[in-house]
């Protein structure tokens, strides 16, 4: 005898509004096998029974959720197979607020997924992304779940909202963040994503007011690693240890980016370096105040920047650009930081 169920999975996820057929069949050496579905809610699909097989048709309504069991018998032998059916709703209906983000403002962003089922926090997860990485430094506020207003009666759908408080987006700001909503079902992971554009200011870069010399620019773990010979600079939020005062870099997306090194021993000299193969050049493109007032040395894949006359580095944004490609790395140097050989 052979007993087969197709599809063979013990858990099946069915999109709302789509139909699914589950065929249960059994061959029998002596005579015809008896096959039938049991444990069926009266509303759960329809069954077509043929000699040696039974076909369960699920209509993809939320009421179709259940666990039917196929029972096959041949003489004195019997087999059974249960199938947990989960009907889900996850249309691409994400709404984000605000419509765009403004750099330099403490702000809350919300992301709402509409017409969802099941409305289970264990099934549905939200993420705020910078590029392909989770945004570091955002604070998740409490999620909200509300029933959608239904035109027709039936099992209700829900909308789920996640809000985040954002760190400052810095300058130059990333072009956009993305809200990503993932529904995790048996043997199925579905994802929708919605862009939240960042308003690109034409004015000169100015970080928000801070009361102390703290790093505040958001970073993502996809940004380039910056190495320093003095005060530690890092863009890998998951890799401790971290300095007590750490400027942070924010790199644009790209396959290979320049790295900024900060040397305290050399009287606050910055070195921008590219290691992306031959023919690459780097240059300083932004510094607090007038770039012309700084001492610059450029030599192909390396560019140095220092203060004239020698003194503490000015608080603000420094940017280094790499060509060809135009990838940039930005470093924010906090104010009121004095060189310290022990740091």
């Amino acid at each position: 005898q052979s007993f087969q169920v197709n599809p063979p999975e013990s858990e099946v996820a069915v999109a709302m509004g789509t139909s699914l057929q589950i065929t249960c069949s059994m061959s029998c050496d002596e005579g015809v096998a008896r096959v039938h579905w049991r444990g069926l809610d009266t509303s759960l699909g329809s069954v077509q029974t043929l000699p040696g097989s039974s076909i369960l048709s699920v209509r993809g309504m939320l009421s179709d959720t259940g666990t039917p069991v196929c029972v096959g018998s041949c003489g004195s032998r019997s087999f059974q197979h249960s199938v947990k059916i989960l009907v889900y709703a996850f249309p691409d209906q994400l709404v984000v607020s605000p419509e765009f983000l403004v750099p330099g403002q403490d702000q809350v962003v919300s992301c709402t997924a509409h017409n969802i089922w099941p409305a289970d926090p264990n099934s549905l997860s939200f993420a705020l992304l910078l590029g392909e990485q989770r945004l570091e430094g955002a604070q998740a506020l409490e999620p909200e779940q509300e029933e959608e207003i239904q035109e027709a009666e039936g099992t209700p759908l829900f909308r789920m909202t996640q809000r985040w408080r954002l760190p400052s987006l810095g300058t130059p700001a990333p072009p956009a963040l993305h809200c990503q909503v993932t529904m995790q079902l048996p043997k199925l992971v579905l994802t929708h994503r919605k862009e939240i554009p960042v308003l690109q200011s034409q004015t000169s870069p100015k970080p928000p007011n801070t009361t102390s010399a703290e790093p505040y620019i958001l970073t993502s773990s996809s940004t380039a690693e910056a190495v320093s010979t003095g005060l530690n600079i890092t863009t890998l939020p998951s890799a401790p240890p971290y300095p007590k005062l750490s400027p942070r870099t924010l790199s644009s997306e790209g396959p290979c980016r320049p790295k900024i090194h900060q040397d305290l021993e050399a009287g606050w000299e910055l070195l921008c370096e590219a290691s992306c193969g031959p023919g690459v050049t780097v240059r300083w493109t932004l510094a607090p105040g007038d770039l012309a007032t700084y001492h610059k040395r450029e030599a192909g894949a390396q560019a140095w920047l220092s203060v004239l006359p020698p003194g503490p580095m000015v608080e603000g944004w420094f940017q280094c650009r790499q060509d060809p490609g135009g990838e940039v790395t930005n470093l924010y140097v906090p104010g009121q930081v004095t060189p310290n050989s022990s740091s």
Epitope: L141, T210, E214, P240, Y242
Partner: antibody
Framework: EVQLLESGGGLVQPGGSLRLSCAAS????????MHWVRQAPGKGLEWISY????????NYADSVKGRFTISRDNSKNTLYLQMNSLRAEDTAVYYC????????????WGKGTTVTVSS | DIQMTQSPSSLSASVGDRVTITCRAS??????LAWYQQKPGKAPKLLIY???SLQSGVPSRFSGSGSGTDFTLTISSLQPEDFATYYC?????????FGQGTKVEIK
């Protein structure tokens, strides 16, 4: 100097109400989200509520939801906590705390005011 | 909710000792963790934020480390004024939650 000063605590019977205030000075009050945190006698710290700088966002711990209301008057640089249907387990020192923009830790705390719920 | 568990609950130490307190989160909080010091009858005082950044005015003998779920507060050389209760707090997501506290007592 940045300062927070709570007031309004006292002895109240179960089921009663009390309104706590927190006067802020030394900083631009409306720029900061604010919190209420409490500490029962001999116990640890428990966050109970926050309010955003403009008052548009509020949230509460499950233990006080539906009974406590947080509000603020930015023109008076004052944070409030209206406490209704008080229970014995609400007995605690209540602190207001300032939330650091872009980082979200509580960087400045008031000295606290004591609320005792007892018959 | 994210649970924060501190260990030990209390410890006895002498002036000059190196003291380590650990804090474990029930799920990752990235680096969104702060440490506070509280003395009897006083409000909590911020020591460390972002897991390892020292708050302005806090002595450098205090340091923090860790990321994700495991964090440590270290006092390199305990001073008489350091005898107090220390709390960790995650602020990655709401509700923000505190550890149960670690009381540092004089041996």
């Amino acid at each position: 100097e940045v300062q927070l000063l709570e007031s309004g605590g006292g002895l109240v019977q179960p089921g009663g109400s009390l309104r706590l205030s927190c006067a802020a000075s030394g900083f631009t009050f409306s720029d900061f989200w604010m919190h209420w945190v409490r500490q029962a006698p001999g116990k640890g710290l428990e966050w109970i509520s926050y309010i955003s700088g403009d008052g548009g966002y509020t949230n509460y711990a499950d233990s006080v939801k539906g009974r406590f209301t947080i509000s603020r008057d930015n023109s008076k640089n004052t944070l409030y906590l209206q406490m209704n249907s008080l229970r014995a387990e609400d007995t605690a020192v209540y602190y207001c705390a300032r939330d650091r923009p872009y980082y979200y830790y509580m960087d400045v705390w008031g000295k606290g005011t004591t609320v005792t719920v007892s018959s | 909710d994210i649970q924060m568990t501190q260990s030990p609950s209390s410890l006895s130490a002498s002036v000059g000792d190196r003291v380590t307190i650990t804090c474990r989160a029930s799920q990752s909080v990235s680096r969104s963790l702060a440490w506070y010091q509280q003395k009897p009858g006083k409000a909590p005082k911020l020591l460390i934020y972002a897991a390892s950044s020292l708050q302005s005015g806090v002595p450098s003998r205090f340091s923090g480390s860790g990321s994700g779920t495991d964090f440590t507060l270290t006092i390199s050389s305990l001073q008489p004024e350091d005898f107090a209760t220390y709390y960790c707090q995650q602020y990655k997501s709401y509700p923000v939650t505190f550890g149960q506290g670690t009381k540092v007592e004089i041996k």
